[in-house]
């Protein structure tokens, strides 16, 4: 996961005239015994917000010890501070832990800025807010690292909920998830509402804050409005969607849908902003900067460099457009969209000058690995990550930040042709053309 | 035209704080940005701090000043001030009130076309 922080181009794609409506196959999906319903001891179980992650507590070990371990979507590593570190109030040690296995064996994760290495073994694992189980899970019980731990964040370790394909150092490493479905009756299903602050919080308030919630086996109806809708995960490796077109204030970018997914989009809460490749970074930020008075802030600002400030109270939220993502949908030629506010891209940061301002910082970045639906999208919606039926849901949340004028929204269905064409294809290293 | 005055500046010691005042006369409707900037001895002039009224007054600072100056306007004095909080000696220098119409980013201090003539404000130790 990025925390934050060439192709073969179809040409005149763009789906059809968007007025054109499919009709709902259905209005709701089917029941499923154990997946959807109220799930009252697991609301309200994260806590921390977007700028440093979204934590859950953990147990590990016998007698259990507790911790708060960072619930990232964008990796496949369950791994957390074994060792002291100045960042960390509390660490996992093993030597106390009586049904701690080793597994005599390391593993070393570099990001593009800092890293992890450590120690793998297995020990009992339960969530306290969660399902009320106990699972043997892989643990990475990380002895060095480098940037990787966040002062203030409040959380010592990372849970990777994405799949095996992408866990270090291969994917014979069972993930947290994969075990948890394998050992016990839990669906193969998880569903998060991240909720942003909308407003600067300080270490105390952070502290008593409540982040949202990770429905760990299903869905939980009071935590969205509307309906759920869903998009196929093209590959199950991170969680990969594909964006099929975007609009600004309802302005289609007219790009090759190919760029939107360039090398490949993927719903991570493990990162902060909504990151885009560079070409659409570009045309989106000419978009947003041409349907508002901003065209004149300073480079360092769209950069996300420079800080915006307002008098408090005072945020001209209509100034800035909003922001249309479309995204495949489970029927054939049928595409969603998914529109986040500037309250979710403008990101509140504390301003240290004074409490008479509000200050922000644009939350939306340029990737060299593709599209990132980091927490800023993630926090307008209740997001479903249904693995059994390879599909995420989206709905509005119900907690997401808005006006009396503009709330984020999930419609469809749209007409949208050919929409397969919108995914990138990775070149794969075929190994036998590599022999000699 | 549009004419700036400054005032307001002054010497503190270290920690302490001082509040500077830019009065602004005549097309001052057609500026889509105010900036504060400042001048060192033997130094290039640097923007601090821009206001942009045409964006209901969205506030900029530079980095070596974040945190510690807020700008400000009163619309209806035609007035932005620059409230500068623990002030330090490297803080010393002539600031400028500055207005502009054209299409520059804020932070070029090239991109201003109307100036003030300045006042000096020194921070001792």
């Known amino acids: 996961t990025q925390h934050g922080i060439r192709l073969p181009l179809r040409s005149g794609l763009g789906g059809a005239p968007l007025g054109l409506r499919l009709p709902r196959e259905t209005d709701e999906e089917p029941e499923e015994p154990g997946r959807r319903g109220s799930f009252v001891e697991m609301v309200d179980n994260l806590r921390g917000k977007s700028g440093q992650g979204y934590y859950v507590e953990m147990t590990v070990g016998s007698p259990p010890q507790t911790l708060n371990i960072l619930v990232d979507t964008g990796s496949s590593n369950f791994a957390v501070g074994a060792a002291p570190h100045p960042f960390l109030h509390r660490y996992y040690q093993r030597q106390l832990s009586s049904t701690y296995r080793d597994l005599r064996k390391g593993v070393y994760v570099p990001y593009t800025q800092g890293k992890w290495e450590g120690e793998l073994g297995t020990d009992l694992v339960s969530i306290p807010h969660g399902p009320n189980v106990t699972v043997r899970a892989n643990i990475a019980a990380i002895t060095e690292s480098d940037k990787f731990f966040i002062n203030g964040s409040n959380w010592e370790g990372i849970l990777g909920l994405a799949y095996a394909e992408i866990a270090r150092p291969d994917d014979s490493l069972e993930p947290f998830f994969d075990s948890l479905v394998k050992q016990t009756h839990v669906p193969n299903l998880f569903s998060l509402q991240l909720c942003g602050a909308g407003f600067p919080l300080n270490q105390s308030e952070v502290l008593a804050s409540v982040g949202g919630s990770m429905i760990i086996g299903g869905i939980d109806h009071s935590l969205y409005t509307g309906s759920l809708w869903y998009t196929p995960i093209r590959r199950e490796w991170y969680y990969e969607v594909i964006i099929v077109r975007v609009e600004i204030n309802g302005q289609d970018l007219k790009m090759d849908c190919k760029e939107y997914n360039y090398d490949k989009s993927i719903v991570d809460s493990g990162t902060t902003n909504l990151r885009l490749p560079k070409k659409v970074f570009e045309a989106a930020v000419k978009s947003i900067k041409a349907a508002s008075s901003t065209e004149k802030f300073p480079d360092g600002f769209w950069l996300g460099e420079q800080l915006v400030c307002w008098q408090a109270g005072t945020t001209p939220w209509n100034i800035f457009p909003v922001i249309s993502l479309y995204l495949m949908g489970e029927v054939t030629n049928q595409s969603f969209r998914i529109t986040i506010l500037p309250q979710q891209y403008l990101r509140p940061v504390e301003d240290v000058a004074t409490s008479q301002d509000d200050c922000y910082k644009f939350a939306i970045s340029q990737s060299s690995t593709g599209t990132v639906m980091g927490a800023v999208i993630m926090e307008g919606f209740y997001v479903v990550f249904d693995r059994a039926r390879k599909r995420i849901g989206f709905a509005v949340s119900a907690c997401h930040v808005h006006d009396e004028f503009r709330t984020a929204a999930v419609e469809g269905p749209f007409v949208t042709l050919d929409m397969e064409d919108c995914g990138y294809n990775i070149p794969q290293t075929d190994e036998s053309t590599l022999m000699t | 035209d549009v004419q700036l005055q400054e005032s307001g500046g002054g010497s503190v010691q270290a920690g302490g704080s001082l509040r500077l005042s830019c009065a602004a006369s005549?097309?001052?409707?057609?500026?889509?940005?105010f900036a504060w900037l400042r001048q060192a001895p033997g130094k290039d002039r640097e923007v601090v701090a821009v206001?942009?009224?045409?964006?209901?007054?969205?506030?900029f600072y530079s980095d070596s000043v974040n945190g510690r100056f807020t700008i400000s306007q009163d619309t209806a004095k035609n007035t932005v001030y620059l409230q500068m909080n623990s002030l330090e000696p490297e803080d010393t220098a002539m600031y400028f009130c500055?207005?502009?119409?054209?299409?520059?980013?804020?932070?070029?201090?090239?991109?201003?076309?109307?100036w003030g003539q300045g006042t000096q404000v020194t921070v001792s130790s």
């Open positions: 500055a207005a502009s119409a054209n299409a520059m980013t804020g932070f070029q201090p090239s991109g201003y076309t109307y």
């Open positions: 005549g097309y001052t409707s057609e500026m889509n940005r």
């Open positions: 206001i942009f009224p045409t964006a209901r007054g969205a506030k």
